[in-house]
Interface confidence: low
């Protein structure tokens, strides 16, 4: 622990004025782990004048930094670059004449206390006035600065000509691009002092490069990946006083892919689970034994989770019987393409057939084709839900099924097994 300081596993405090410290406290190698330090308190250190760029970087877990009644005159711009956990900074009664917002812009500070410093009235500290004005808490500080006549001026009254917040404005209200294509986003910035323009692209996967010319900037994104759909891109204008940003959400359009289709599982209902990716949202259509499966309250598609351009869901079946056994194909399509995937589903054996003693009964419960297969001739009986002679009317009520209309947009008809016989035999 440095001279004139005391240390614990999580705190460093340097409050003894004599002999005092002349540099920001650093821990000796092989002593306390600096990453565990959450609080540093420095007081009465008149000879501590500077915080250098690398003084604080080791204290990555630092939350509270207090330097009061000391001689602090200068803080390096990048001093707190590695201290993303900093929440409270108190530099009360030091010798700071200027302090840039660049020191703190990446931090999510709850408190920045700066009273009792001899700030010089200039555009450099106008950001503090703006910060005070936008702060929601009523306990705003009484900050002052020294004007040209060395008179104390309340920061709240500070008027500096040509010193205001910048503005940023994107040229496009929304940004929709097809996967693999390229796009250029334009942005205009303005303000006095003239702001710098930069782009915040977050974790954008696609290759991108930017160019700035005067108050106009452009961001070129090439070979756009579908993984970037939903990401936010921001144009930021920054000057001494503060920053403004305008953001746009990137929407990437791409053809659907059925990334997952599995055999039925039974919970409250039977479910054929699937995952589909695509944008715009793909239209889903199921086929049963090669024919269109019209949905009803007994058989319907449910999307349970939507993760922007990925949809997780089920083909939900109410009380399926042996008559629902067969091949189920999911087709997903949008204006950029389509995908098909098929499984074979086996819900229960045929009544009266002991299939353990019947070697001809299929034991394969499902298969998975990742490429489209022959989905059958829809003019034959492939869209017929297989029927048996069911004598018990109460059972028959549970075995009502849908028959598909030729036209996709046609009315869905709920019919019974008996109707199915008539429909196909007359």
């Amino acid at each position: 622990c440095p001279m004139s300081c005391k240390c614990s596993t999580t705190r460093i405090w340097c409050t003894e004025p004599s002999p005092g410290i002349v540099a920001f406290p650093r821990l000796e190698p092989n002593s306390i782990d600096p990453e565990n330090i959450t609080e540093i308190l420095i007081a009465n250190q008149k000879r501590l004048e500077i915080i250098n760029e690398d003084d604080v970087e080791a204290y990555v877990g630092l939350k509270n930094l207090t330097i009061v009644d000391s001689g602090l005159k200068f803080v390096a711009y990048k001093a707190f670059l590695k201290n993303g956990n900093l929440r409270h900074i108190n530099f009360t009664r030091n010798k700071l004449t200027s302090l840039s917002r660049r020191h703190f812009r990446h931090l999510d500070l709850s408190d920045l206390i700066l009273t009792g410093n001899p700030f010089t009235c200039s555009c450099d500290i106008m950001w503090l006035k703006t910060l005070q004005e936008t702060k929601s808490s009523p306990d705003t500080q009484d900050l002052y600065c020294l004007n040209e006549s060395s008179k104390n001026t309340p920061l709240a009254n500070l008027q500096i000509p040509n010193c205001g917040l910048p503005s940023a404005r994107l040229a496009a209200p929304n940004l929709t691009v097809e996967e693999g294509k390229s796009v250029t986003i334009s942005c205009s910035v303005g303000g006095d002092p003239l702001p710098t323009l930069y782009w915040d692209v977050g974790n954008l996967v696609s290759k991108h490069m930017n160019e700035t010319s005067h108050t106009q900037g452009s961001l070129r994104i090439t070979n756009i990946s579908s993984d970037d759909s939903g990401k936010q891109i921001s144009c930021v204008a920054e000057n001494l006083v503060g920053e403004d940003q305008d953001s746009v959400n990137l929407t990437v359009h791409f053809a659907p892919t059925i990334t997952f289709l599995e055999s039925p599982t039974s919970d409250h209902h039977w479910c054929i689970p699937f995952t589909v990716r695509g944008n715009p949202k793909p239209a889903l259509q199921w086929f049963y034994n090669g024919a269109i499966l019209n949905e009803s309250k007994y058989i319907c598609t449910k999307i349970h989770v939507t993760n922007h351009t990925e949809y997780h869901g089920c083909l939900q079946l109410d009380n399926p019987t042996h008559m629902n056994n067969g091949d189920y194909t999911l087709m997903a399509k949008n204006e950029y393409g389509k995908d098909e995937r098929q499984i074979s589903a086996h819900f229960m054996g045929r009544p009266g057939v002991d299939y353990e003693t019947n070697p001809n009964y299929p034991e394969v419960l499902y298969e998975d084709w990742t490429t489209p297969t022959d989905i059958g001739d829809t003019t034959n009986k492939s869209n017929e839900i297989p029927s048996t002679d069911v004598a018990d009317q109460t059972n028959r009520e549970h075995e009502q099924k849908l028959i598909s209309e030729e036209d996709l947009g046609g009315e869905q008809k709920l019919i019974s097994e008996e109707d199915l016989h008539h429909h196909h035999h007359h």
Epitope: A171, P173, N174, T184, S186, S188, G190, E211, S213, Q216
Partner: antibody
Framework: EVQLQQSGPELVKPGASVKISCKAS????????MNWVKQSHGKSLEWIGD????????SYNQKFKGKATLTVDKSSSTAYMELRSLTSEDSAVYYC????????????WGQGTTLTVSS | DIVMSQSPSSLAVSAGEKVTMSCKSS????????????LAWYQQKPGQSPKLLIY???TRESGVPDRFTGSGSGTDFTLTISSVQAEDLAVYYC????????FGSGTQLEIK
């Protein structure tokens, strides 16, 4: 065919407020910024502000901040501009205009709404 | 703010004549990367809404007669009507879109 149909003329008293509408048809409202422009009698055109119909985000000419409020109703494809604390200086024709190509130029305009502020 | 100045404020020509009008901006409207000038020209006939004629300083909007030509770059721009017709009686406005939007004061074209 793209059309911007504005509400009819308004005669209002000083100090009152007025809300002008602009119904878009022939295109998807959310694909383009909607701009509003003022033209006082015999004078030039002044850009008031614009709105991004997707999220309701607005930009204003500094001169009209506090005077004009822009909104949209996506369900009816209609943009609105409310003008408050009206004075005779606000008497003018007000246009809505669709912002094309990143809103750099205005390719379709409404027919204009005449506002007269008089006691 | 960018200030747009148009001249002359009005001019009268005979049908068939060539006419030019000027528009100057207080700062460059050229984006050096895209090579685009953020300037448009609009025509407003009496009792009508403005109509887009030219954008990017020189690109004619579809349906606009080819007698209308836009030219210029940076801060100085010109709208030329090669052979004025009676139906061209209107006020012509330039507008910048480099930073927000500002219109010029307009040039009134009268037919003798």
């Amino acid at each position: 065919e793209v059309q911007l149909q504005q509400s009819g003329p308004e005669l209002v008293k000083p100090g009152a407020s007025v809300k002008i509408s602009c119904k878009a048809s022939g295109y998807t409202l959310t694909d383009y910024y909607m701009n509003w422009v003022k033209q006082s009698h015999g004078k030039s055109l002044e850009w008031i502000g614009d709105i991004n119909p997707n999220n309701g985000g607005t930009s204003y000419n500094q001169k009209f901040k506090g005077k004009a409020t822009l909104t949209v109703d996506k369900s009816s494809s209609t943009a609105y501009m409310e003008l408050r604390s009206l004075t005779s200086e606000d008497s003018a024709v007000y246009y809505c205009a669709r912002g094309a190509y990143y809103s750099n130029y205005f390719d379709y305009w409404g027919q204009g709404t005449t506002l007269t502020v008089s006691s | 703010d960018i200030v747009m100045s148009q001249s002359p404020s009005s001019l009268a020509v005979s049908a068939g004549e060539k006419v030019t009008m000027s528009c100057k901006s207080s700062q460059s409207l050229l984006n050096s990367r895209t090579r685009k000038n953020y300037l448009a020209w609009y025509q407003q006939k009496p009792g009508q809404s403005p109509k887009l004629l030219i954008y990017w300083a020189s690109t004619r909007e579809s349906g606009v007669p080819d007698r209308f030509t836009g030219s210029g770059s940076g801060t100085d721009f010109t709208l030329t009507i090669s052979s004025v017709q009676a139906e061209d009686l209107a006020v012509y406005y330039c507008k910048q879109s480099y930073i927000l939007f500002t219109f010029g004061s307009g040039t009134q074209l009268e037919i003798k």
